[in-house]
């Protein structure tokens, strides 16, 4: 592989690494969305909630003069609970029905698939470095692209979950916004998907430049 190509691959792999870190952060944190109730619920405090793939947390936040609930970063009494279908022994009280069980399970499962693809891609990359097997970068690129797509699906499932929670008559949440875990997931999708495609392009053998050349005539990769 030429030096130019090697540099391109390294930059792409760095972007992929950033995507992996962002994807991991999104999966393990619970600030995908922040939900808040009617402001009139409490005189001095309001109970906002933030949740992720695995658990939901509520926080009693002191209300400011503008009668808004938040931001969620304000200090307050926090109460976190894993979704009951992930931890059958624990009662998630107010939170169980507010999250659509099938949505939550789907988003988490797809996110796990994404991490699986990331692991497979990383194994291929490591093996390609070890014995200069550059052809392993191609399956690696596909795995990273699939991982990005899985993250995208997870993001969309979570969006639908939030929409249903807000629309449902069985919840008190009336307002919402997407938070930094959600942003991490979106950024992870962009990095993994685009970098995966870029890696695929950079790892392909050079196309023949002249009509009389065949792919076999193209200069070898090593």
């Amino acid at each position: 592989m030429s030096q130019t190509k090697t540099l391109k691959v390294r930059v792409t792999l760095f972007c992929i690494l950033a995507g992996i870190v962002l994807a991991m952060t999104a999966v393990v944190t619970d600030h995908w969305a922040v939900l808040s109730p009617h402001m009139e619920h409490h005189n001095t405090t309001c109970e906002a909630a933030h949740f992720g793939l695995w658990r939901i947390c509520t926080k009693r936040i002191p209300m400011d003069d503008s009668k808004t609930c938040g931001p969620i970063t304000l200090p307050g009494e926090k109460n976190c609970s894993y979704f009951r279908h992930f931890n059958p022994g624990e009662s998630s009280e107010i939170f169980e029905f507010t999250t659509q069980k099938e949505y939550s399970i789907s988003a988490a499962a797809i996110a796990i698939f994404s991490l699986g693809f990331v692991i497979l891609g990383s194994l291929c990359v490591l093996l390609s470095f070890g014995k200069k097997r550059d052809y392993l970068l191609r399956p690696a690129s596909m795995f990273y692209t699939f991982a990005g797509l899985c993250i995208l699906v997870s993001v969309e499932v979570m969006r639908q979950s939030v929409k249903r929670m807000i629309d449902s008559e069985d919840t008190v949440w009336i307002e919402y916004y997407y938070s930094w875990s959600f942003a991490c997931a979106c950024a992870a999708f962009v990095l993994l998907f685009l970098s995966g495609l870029a890696l695929l392009l950079f790892s392909l053998p050079r196309m023949p430049r002249n009509p009389w050349e065949s792919c076999m005539d193209a200069e070898p990769e090593h």
Epitope: M39, E40, F97, E169, D170, T171, I174
Partner: antibody, heavy 116, light 108 residues
Framework: QVQLQESGPGLVKPSETLSLTCTVS????????WTWLRQPPGKGLEWIGY???????NYNPSLKSRVTISVDTSKNQFSLKLNSVTAADTAVYYC??????????WGQGTLVTVSS | EIVLTQSPGTLSLSPGERATLSCRAS???????LAWYQQRPGQAPRLLIY???NRATAIPDRFSGSGSGTDFTLTISRLEPEDFEVYSC?????????FGGGTKVEIK
């Protein structure tokens, strides 16, 4: 399919306490919010307040000083108590599933008349 | 609290005609959180529309909701005999929840 049924006395004397019970069938009272509303004859509906199965409640400010909503999960019931009633409290009282949004599941309603 | 005013109080129409019911709020309703109900005499209200324009489950598509801010409309495209009832609007944009006084749709 969840069904709700209100029960209680149809006649209450002024200054006394109005007590109604809503029995939930077809679903557990757990994990849901439950609401009381009322409709005076020929008038619009009025939201009284709601309770969560864990016991936390929220009331309409105009009735807050007189109203108490409680829940009995073992019987799958929730109740309304309205103190110091007057003729203005004469209405059809409804129980419904939900809290502070719209209401899809309602009881049939029970008419309570306040009269001596 | 938000006061909801429905107009007209009574609407006289024939089956097959189009009905347009209005609900005006005393202040802006957050996120268009408005619902419409149909109520038959001696029965509980039946949810028709929520979120100003979303039809509830099993509600025929002749019922549609529109509007935003302070002005909302329920439209029944072709009145069926069973549609001649009382219709109420309800806001859930802020507490306390409030309802309109209702519009009675009667046969002309």
């Amino acid at each position: 399919q969840v069904q709700l049924q209100e029960s209680g006395p149809g006649l209450v004397k002024p200054s006394e306490t109005l007590s109604l019970t809503c029995t939930v069938s077809g679903d557990s009272i757990n994990n849901y919010y439950w609401t009381w509303l009322r409709q005076p004859p020929g008038k619009g509906l009025e939201w009284i307040g709601y309770i969560y199965y864990s016991g936390s409640a929220n009331y309409n400010p105009s009735l807050k000083s007189r109203v108490t909503i409680s829940v009995d999960t073992s019987k799958n019931q929730f109740s309304l108590k309205l103190n110091s009633v007057t003729a203005a409290d004469t209405a059809v009282y409804y129980c419904a599933r939900g809290a502070v949004k719209y209401f899809r599941h309602w009881g049939q309603g029970t008419l309570v008349t306040v009269s001596s | 609290e938000i006061v909801l005013t429905q107009s007209p109080g009574t609407l006289s129409l024939s089956p097959g005609e189009r009905a347009t019911l209005s609900c005006r709020a005393s202040q802006t309703i957050n996120h268009n959180n408005l619902a419409w109900y149909q109520q038959r005499p001696g029965q509980a209200p039946r949810l028709l529309i929520y979120g100003a324009s979303n039809r509830a489950t099993a509600i025929p598509d002749r019922f549609s909701g529109s509007g935003s801010g302070t002005d909302f409309t329920l439209t029944i495209s072709r009145l069926e005999p069973e549609d001649f009832e009382v219709y109420s609007c309800q806001q859930y944009g802020s507490l306390p929840l409030t309802f309109g006084g209702g519009t009675k749709v009667e046969i002309k």
